[in-house]
Amino acid sequence: VSITKCNSDMNGYCLHGQCIYLVDMSQNYCRCEVGYTGVRCEHFYL
């Protein structure tokens, strides 16, 4: 899978994590920090 950093318009897309652009899947993906979950790392689960 080809990945790159998200475009600058997606700054702030991931609330508690890093935004990655999955090129072949045509979508952004949030790699969440420890303790966070959700599509945009918006939920704290500890």
Partner: antibody, heavy 116, light 106 residues
Amino acid sequence: QDQLVQSGAEVKKPGASVKVSCKASGFNIKDTYIQWVRQAPGQGLEWMGRRDPLRGNTKYREKFEGRVTITADTSTNTAYMELSSLRSEDTAVYYCVRSGTLFDFWGQGTLVTVSS
Amino acid sequence: DIQMTQSPSSLSASVGDRVTITCKASQDIHKYIAWYQQKPGQAPRLLIQYTSTLQPGVPSRFSGSGSGTDYTFTISSLQPEDIATYYCLQYDNLRTFGGGTKVEIK
């Protein structure tokens, strides 16, 4: 199956306002950004602005600033675009577009006609 | 706002011809460009995103290339069903469409 279903065609008088809705199904709008694009008859595509329903922030194209308002109701999974002080040049098809989790998934479009 | 200058605005070519459309951005858009095809009365259809990534179901005669501020969209062998208007879209910093290119058959 993911869908963006927009409200029906509108006819408005110059100076009036119009509010177009965009109801999402199959996904949560809080996971996305909702963009709005318009296309006047025989003209090109024009980006108007976008809403982040989770954070609640909005960005607009400069030319529409002060005249367009993009909102979202996360309880009904619906986004809205309101354009005020309508003029004949605002006659166009207005599209909502989902981005973020999936690159640019479009609604079917809503024709807004401004005529006296 | 980033400006996108698309050229030509229209072109006429024969079936089987190679067709090239260019888009120039007013600043580096880091390969964040998409290409759409629009036929009359229809919503735009995404063909390519991130400069060169073809969407599922899109014929391989369509391709894209470029970097920095200069990008190219190519139809390697024009087919009758390719008659449409094509738009570039930068999505690096907010969004801006190019002015469109109407492709016709000679």
